[in-house]
Amino acid sequence: MKSGLWYFFLFCLRIKVLTGEINGSANYEMFIFHNGGVQILCKYPDIVQQFKMQLLKGGQILCDLTKTKGSGNTVSIKSLKFCHSQLSNNSVSFFLYNLDHSHANYYFCNLSIFDPPPFKVTLTGGYLHIYESQLCCQLKFWLPIGCAAFVVVCILGCILICWLTKKKYSSSVHDPNGEYMFMRAVNTAKKSRLTDVTL
């Protein structure tokens, strides 16, 4: 049941990326939709060895990843604002899940290059537009109605079954032989109770 709802959610959410609308827009596919979420790809040049990459939603820092090296060429990778992220030799991918309308916004990759010098900051970004398809909206509208109708049908079915059972039962009570048998059962029960009391 859970997986069914999840697939429905995936079906409903579709992502459209509008790049080139902002200054320093990414000249690559920045948003990759998969597994019920979005992978936001932040690229950096191959020569960059030490850096801080921040994912900004509007002006707010959502995630960050810092890669530095110590004096013995030992690598340190830190996150102050942790998100599920993936580091490669020329990109950092940040993953956002459980998408809804609130995720629609401008997203920026804010890259601070420490090494090689000089220190440099670059900003690239794009707009992540999340909308629901017409079919989704129709399904969203009809699904509760369908569920309600199903429940009503179930209840009516139960009532009908109960009514039919009662009808069948009452017809058997009106049968003369049936009535005689019923009376006998009651009398026997009464006798046994009296016997119990006497003892």
């Epitope: 020569i47 060895q49 030490q50 810092t66 530095t68 090296k69 110590g70 004096s71 013995g72 060429n73 030992t74 340190s76 830190k78 420490f114 090494d115 090689p116 010098p117």
Partner: antibody, heavy 117, light 111 residues
Framework: EVQLVESGGGLVKPGGSLTLSCAAS????????MDWVRQGPGKGLEWVGN????????YYAPFVKGRFTISRDNAKKTLYLQMNSVKSEDTATYYC??????????WGQGTLVTVSS | DIVMTQSPSSLAVSPGDKVTINCKSS??????????LAWYQQKTGQAPKLLIF???TRHTGVPDRFMGSGSGTDFSLTINSFQTEDLGDYYC?????????FGPGTKLEIK
């Protein structure tokens, strides 16, 4: 302006302990790896060890062999070097240094540690 | 551990001289496009100061008479026109691996 000021040096007996401190100012201390480098009297420079930005990882020179511990308090912007089981060959001026991504770009004035009975 | 050697161990110079200090590593310090080697100057009674990093890049505020060169295992520091304030000890240092090690130093003295 970046400033590193060491303190805590002095005379200590062999086998004894000493803690050196390094107060940092003029930069975001929690953004940098920090190192200790020492220099014996009339000798060259020798790397002691380092610590990463949040203090979770440390590396030491082979001669340390578990005797020294580097730690940091980012809230106090202070670097520490805890020296245990000191030997006469640990006599040196100890420098606190900032690893500026690709070299030791800032050094303290140094603090002298003398190990003698 | 990578062993760093320097030559000469000391050198007597006069103001205006071109001075060259050599540094050799026991293995290549080249990684990608970068040589993981730095040069430091230490004046008497003072802490060392960074001059050159990545074998040839001058640190901020370092006079342009100081030049670093070399690649792989052989490096040199050149002072194009030696001045009296350049007196002191010069150390090369690698940061290719742990532990980072320093050369034994070269002492520059007045002739």
């Amino acid at each position: 302006e970046v400033q590193l000021v060491e303190s805590g040096g002095g005379l200590v007996k062999p086998g004894g302990s000493l803690t050196l401190s390094c107060a940092a100012s003029g930069f975001t201390f929690s953004d940098y790896w920090m190192d200790w480098v020492r220099q014996g009297p009339g000798k060259g420079l020798e790397w002691v060890g380092n610590i990463d930005e949040d203090g979770s990882t440390t590396y030491y020179a082979p001669f340390v062999k578990g005797r020294f511990t580097i730690s940091r308090d980012n809230a106090k912007k202070t670097l520490y070097l805890q020296m245990n089981s000191v030997k006469s060959e640990d006599t040196a001026t100890y420098y606190c240094t900032r690893w500026g991504r690709y070299a030791f770009d800032s050094w303290g004035q140094g603090t002298l540690v003398t190990v003698s009975s | 551990d990578i062993v760093m050697t320097q030559s000469p161990s000391s050198l007597a110079v006069s103001p205006g001289d071109k001075v060259t200090i050599n540094c050799k590593s026991s293995q290549s310090l080249l990684s990608g496009n970068y040589n993981y080697l730095a040069w430091y100057q230490q004046k008497t009674g003072q802490a060392p100061k960074l001059l050159i990093f990545y074998a040839s890049t001058r640190h901020t505020g370092v006079p342009d008479r100081f030049m670093g060169s070399g690649s792989g295992t052989d490096f040199s520091l050149t002072i194009n026109s030696f001045q009296t304030e350049d007196l002191g000890d010069y150390y090369c240092q690698h940061h290719y691996s742990t532990p980072p090690t320093f050369g034994p130093g070269t002492k520059l003295e007045i002739k």
